[in-house]
Interface confidence: low
């Protein structure tokens, strides 16, 4: 089977504070079975910013429909983006298990937020 | 309001164990990072441990081996178990919440964990 | 690891003055430095992160600045709750994070 390679084409992404952020994320295999979580941050500060098991993420919302067995389109977008979302965003699969395991992450995605246009 | 309320220290005997609980309210607990900070007396602070939302861990070198940080998101509570305490890790033990970017924006009032014979 | 100087040990001043307090990091730490304040018998609180950006209901007498390896923690007429214990701590490696060993400012 194919190795998995997670794919965040855009190093970075700069947005108007109150628009939506389009976060980029596919990867390139279904295997390992198990989820994609995105995260802000790295190491004990990273925070979870969306699980495809857990919620609700009320200001995150799927571009595709994840749900579907052989989806391979992760990205999500961030509504109502403000300066506290800036950061660099991780894509990262996890291995299913009790619990989970940490598999393989995408490179990132740095977010900027732009002053709202008076 | 965030709060933070640990509990579980005392005196114990070099060699011996305890369990510090760190119980979490105010927040969505299972988004954050936690840690904990100790201070002995008179020092200043010192970063033990910490744990990302999804359970990632994280140690000093000087505790590696002998303490382990864990978490109940469903309890929205954070652990530290200490063994083969020194009296070196006498302090007052913080739990923190870890904000976006590594600093503590939030902290508890601390426990004493005194280590002596 | 980073290791961070903090400087000078004790400060004695008076209510009123202004106060300067320095954080030496032994590295470039990209102006990740937070810095708290702690008084006796309480938890640290945060005053300032990323070098310069206050936390939330931190007064306009507390500034901090910096960049590269040297950072200071201002406090523009010191009010007598502002006596305390000052530490920084760098937050831009987490393996470990450190703090600085703390700067003491009391009642002259």
């Known amino acids: 089977e194919e190795e998995l390679q997670i794919i965040q084409p855009d190093k970075s992404v700069s947005v108007a504070a109150g628009e939506s952020a389009i976060l980029h994320c596919t990867i390139t295999s279904l295997f390992p079975v198990g989820p994609i979580q995105w995260f802000r941050g790295a190491g004990p500060a990273r925070v979870l910013i969306y699980n495809q098991r857990q919620g609700p993420f009320p200001r995150v919302t799927t571009v595709s429909e994840t749900t579907k067995r052989e989806n391979m389109d992760f990205s999500i977008s961030i509504s109502n983006i403000t300066p506290a979302d800036a950061g660099t965003y991780y894509c990262i699969k996890f291995r299913k298990g009790s619990p989970d395991t940490e598999f393989k992450s995408g490179a990132g995605t740095e977010l900027s937020v732009r002053a709202k246009p008076s | 309001d965030v709060q933070l309320v640990e509990s579980g220290g005392g005196l114990v005997q070099p060699g011996g164990s305890l369990r510090l609980s760190c119980t979490a309210s105010g927040f969505t607990f299972r988004n954050y990072g936690m840690s904990w900070v100790r201070q002995a007396p008179g020092e200043g602070l010192e970063w033990v441990s910490a744990?990302?939302?999804?359970?990632?861990?994280y140690y000093t070198d000087s505790v590696k081996g002998r303490f382990t940080i864990s978490r109940d998101n469903s309890k929205n509570t954070l652990y530290l178990q200490m063994n083969s305490l020194r009296a070196e890790d006498t302090a007052i033990y913080y739990c923190a919440k870890v904000t976006w970017n590594n600093f503590f924006d939030y902290w508890g009032l601390g426990t004493l964990v005194t280590v002596s014979s | 690891e980073i290791v961070l100087t903090q400087s000078p040990g004790t400060l004695s001043v008076s209510p009123g003055e202004r106060v300067t307090l320095t954080c030496r990091a032994s590295q470039g730490i990209a102006g990740k430095i937070a810095w708290y304040q702690q008084k006796p018998g309480q938890a640290p609180r945060l005053l300032i992160y990323?070098?310069?950006s206050r936390a939330t209901g931190i007064p306009g007498r507390f500034s901090g600045s910096g960049s590269g390896t040297e950072f200071t923690l201002t406090i523009t007429s010191l009010q007598s709750e502002d006596f305390a214990v000052y530490y920084c701590?760098?937050?831009?490696?987490?393996?470990?994070?450190?703090f600085g060993g703390g700067t003491k400012v009391e009642i002259k």
């Open positions: 744990s990302s939302g999804s359970g990632s861990t």
């Open positions: 990323d070098a310069s």
């Open positions: 701590q760098q937050h831009y490696d987490w393996s470990p994070l450190t």
